[in-house]
């Protein structure tokens, strides 16, 4: 699997940001489809449990996530993007995503480190 | 087979209310955030709705907001759009759209006339 | 809210020929944009996605191209069947925009 993200993400506290990540594959999409998002702090503590799709999505029970991710994900378009809702400054960090598609279980995980601001200062500003 | 069907629409008056429905059939629905389009007389295409999975966050154009409601029932397979203080711009075949667009509907048309 | 451009407006053409709309897009959109086919009487159809992908069972006389504010629809030889209207739409930023139309015609 091949994954492409934008790798770097500016967006303002309060808002929602969409953080994109699509694939390839040699194998075609099914129902073993598999996406695992994960998110690194910037002050080094330890990886937190953000998202999991397979089929179905699954929302994060507990934690800094809960009630503020969304899957926005499409296999058919090869889409295995999410929604997060109201930025806070502590989410800035990197979020990784995993996808396997078995037989084609194996890649480079994709990685979008997100800089959550006060105010916009460049046009890389993802809504949605 | 992926199917979307609208329904709902019809002849409203200015500040009328409209609801409008749209059946979801051959895809896992709860899985997929979904929209509704609108298309003007003049042919214009307009996003008027979005829902996402979940907890069903949801998002408006700056013309419709405060008086569109999008929600939907997973259980049911259905995708709404309430619609509220109608003015005779919201004049339109209205579609409801997997995810960013992937599929539509056929439509059901709107029409905001006294 | 971004202005999707979109050129032509209509294109008469024969069949066999090649044909090019674009879209500009009023700021960077990365390549978060789709095209769409609209035939007489139907709704749209996905055609194009992420700019350059094209969707399941689209044949591929049609491409897209372009990334930031510049995108190019192709169809590398229409036949009768492509008369429609083809929109372009951006879906970076909300409020989601779409471009004005082009109606292709077949002499």
């Known amino acids: 699997v091949e994954i492409y993200t934008s790798r770097v993400l500016e967006a303002v506290n309060g808002t929602d940001a969409r953080l994109k990540c699509t694939f390839s594959s040699f194998a075609p999409v099914g129902d073993a489809l598999t996406v695992t998002w994960n998110f690194r702090p910037l002050d080094g503590g330890p990886e937190q449990f953000v998202f999991y799709y397979h089929i179905d999505p699954f929302q994060p029970m507990s934690g800094r996530f809960k009630d503020r991710v969304s899957w926005d994900g499409n296999p058919e378009r090869y889409d295995a993007s999410i929604l997060l809702w109201k930025l806070q400054f502590d989410d800035n960090g990197t979020y990784t995503c995993q996808v396997k598609n078995p037989p084609d279980v194996d890649g480079v995980i994709g990685e979008i480190r997100l800089s959550v601001v006060h105010t916009v200062r460049f046009s890389e500003i993802h809504f949605l | 087979e992926v199917k979307l069907v609208e329904s709902g629409g019809g002849l409203v008056q200015p500040g009328g209310s409209l609801k409008l429905s749209c059946a979801a059939s051959?895809?896992?629905?709860?899985?997929?955030?979904m929209s509704w389009v609108r298309q003007t007389p003049e042919k214009r295409l307009e996003w008027v709705a979005y829902?996402?999975?979940?907890?069903?966050?949801?998002y408006y154009p700056d013309t419709v907001k405060g008086r569109f409601t999008i929600s939907r029932d997973n259980a049911k397979n259905t995708l709404y759009l309430q619609m509220s203080s109608l003015k005779s711009e919201d004049t339109a075949m209205y579609y409801c759209?997997?995810?960013?667009?992937?599929?539509w509907g056929q439509g059901t048309s709107v029409t905001v006339s006294s | 809210s971004i202005v999707m451009t979109q050129t032509p407006k209509f294109l008469l053409v024969s069949a066999g020929d090649r044909v090019t709309i674009t879209c500009k897009a009023s700021?960077?959109?990365?390549?978060?944009v789709a095209w769409y086919q609209q035939k007489p009487g139907q709704s749209p159809k996905l055609l194009i996605y992420y700019a350059s992908n094209r969707y399941t069972g689209v044949p591929d006389r049609f491409t897209g191209s372009g990334y930031g504010t510049d995108f190019t629809f192709t169809i590398s030889t229409v036949q009768a069947e492509d008369l429609a209207v083809y929109f372009c739409?951006?879906?970076?930023?909300?409020?989601?925009?779409f471009g004005g139309g082009t109606k292709l015609e077949i002499k």
């Open positions: 700021q960077s959109v990365s390549n978060d």
């Open positions: 759209a997997r995810h960013r667009g992937d599929y």
């Open positions: 051959g895809f896992t629905f709860s899985s997929y955030t």
């Open positions: 739409q951006q879906d970076y930023s909300s409020p989601w925009t």
């Open positions: 829902i996402t999975t979940g907890a069903g966050r949801t």
